[in-house]
């Protein structure tokens, strides 16, 4: 049983090898099987891995860039997750999230189809505020610290990729 599980894991790791030649793995429990991995130099939080892409690209190119690495633009599900993410961000930069409003009717959608929950959003005050600005970024405002803002999707920004940990 343990052998077949290991074989499965190895074949899964091979899929990642093209873009992630090196993995950082940690033991999650006492059992030898309880380890999880993130590509090096991605950071890990709970069951996910995160990568800050510092190249300035449009939202579409940023999402493409993440998907090529087996990830998506980041979907933020909790305040704790956002608090972890911002530790690795620069205050003078903005970063695309995996959040957009395709119809321009303020029906926001996450790239992975996670339901948009109004109660777990971190918009800056007064945001979102423009119907033709249909992509979301996270940035720092001295008055409110880190929060979200709507911007034009074609404006190049840095971005954050997120993927499930490799078990």
């Amino acid at each position: 049983f343990m052998y077949s599980k290991t074989v499965k894991r190895l074949s899964k790791l091979r899929e990642y090898q093209q873009y992630h030649p090196s993995l950082t793995c940690v033991m999650e429990g006492k059992d030898i099987e309880d380890w999880s991995c993130c590509p090096t130099p991605w950071t890990s939080f709970q069951s996910s891995c995160y990568f800050i892409s510092t190249g300035m690209q449009s939202w579409t190119k940023s999402q493409k860039n993440c998907s090529v690495m087996g990830a998506d633009l980041v979907v933020i599900n909790t305040r704790e997750e956002q608090d972890f993410i911002i530790q690795n961000l620069k205050r003078n930069s903005s970063y695309f999230l995996g959040l957009s409003d395709p119809g321009g009717r303020r029906h926001w959608q996450w790239v992975d189809q996670t339901p948009y929950n109004e109660n777990v959003t971190f918009w800056h005050s007064g945001e979102p505020n423009n119907l033709d600005e249909r992509c979301a970024i996270i940035n720092f405002r001295s008055s409110e610290e880190w929060g979200w803002n709507d911007i034009h999707c074609h404006v190049p920004q840095k971005s954050i990729c997120k993927m499930k940990k490799i078990y």
Epitope: G104, N129, D132, E133, V155
Partner: antibody, heavy 123, light 111 residues
Framework: EVQLVESGGGLVKPGGSLRLSCAAS????????MSWVRQAPGKGLEWVAY????????YYPDSVKGRFTISRDNAKNSLYLQMNSLRAEDTAVYYC????????????????WGQGTLVTVSS | DIVMTQSPDSLAVSLGERATINCKSS??????????MNWYQQKPGQPPKLLIY???TLESGVPSRFSGSGSGTDFTLTISSLQAEDVATYYC?????????FGGGTKVEIK
């Protein structure tokens, strides 16, 4: 009927300033991102600036950044371009254009253009 | 910046004949099967007029003899049967990523 009418062009010396205006009518001006695009005599089209519908966000190419400022007054249905430190290479017809978004707002086209106003920078 | 290269620079076509203009972008302007490619027509002394957006969607009121095709980095504007009123300069444009950039233009004349 959508109409965009530019004004304010003219002859100005190098280093001088000029303020262009674009009066919009026939649509809800405050709902649209707007651009300025220029065309040097006998040349192609070059984007100069755009401003979001609410006026909070503005963008420029490197060629004009720090010298040109785009602004708008939604109450007056007007778009402006303040041009400072003008150079001979800024000589062009300046058009204002409306953005129309498609494919879920990822992209846009400039669906309406004004007739343009000529700016000549020469000593 | 994304560079848009149009060819040819000019084109002379007989009335009723087909005119084809090409536009190549320095990098892909697609996402999820959609393209951020637009085509404009500019007649002498007039502002540009939007003909086609999203690579192949005809703007309202534009005659059906105009069509657009292509994806990725290679796009084409076709006038199936050239009319006298089609004499103009045609420009491609991408709006995938700022700054929005235009091709150098293709001048279409009657042979």
């Amino acid at each position: 009927e959508v109409q965009l009418v530019e004004s304010g062009g003219g002859l100005v010396k190098p280093g001088g300033s000029l303020r262009l205006s674009c009066a919009a009518s026939g649509f809800t001006f405050s709902s649209y991102t707007m651009s300025w695009v220029r065309q040097a005599p006998g040349k192609g089209l070059e984007w100069v600036a755009y401003i979001s519908s609410g006026g909070g966000n503005t963008y420029y190419p490197d060629s004009v950044k720090g010298r040109f400022t785009i602004s708008r007054d939604n109450a007056k249905n007007s778009l402006y371009l303040q041009m400072n430190s003008l150079r001979a290479e800024d000589t062009a017809v300046y058009y204002c254009a409306r953005h129309d978004y498609y494919d879920g707002g990822l992209y846009y086209a400039m669906d309406y253009w004004g007739q343009g106003t000529l700016v000549t920078v020469s000593s | 910046d994304i560079v848009m290269t149009q060819s040819p620079d000019s084109l002379a076509v007989s009335l009723g004949e087909r005119a084809t203009i090409n536009c190549k972008s320095s990098q892909s302007v697609d996402y999820d099967g959609d393209s951020s490619m637009n085509w404009y027509q500019q007649k002498p002394g007039q502002p540009p007029k939007l003909l086609i957006y999203a690579a192949s969607t005809l703007e309202s009121g534009v005659p059906s003899r105009f069509s657009g095709s292509g994806s990725g980095t290679d796009f084409t504007l076709t006038i199936s049967s050239l009319q006298a009123e089609d004499v103009a300069t045609y420009y491609c444009q991408q709006t995938n990523e700022d700054p929005p950039t235009f091709g150098g233009g293709t001048k279409v004349e009657i042979k």
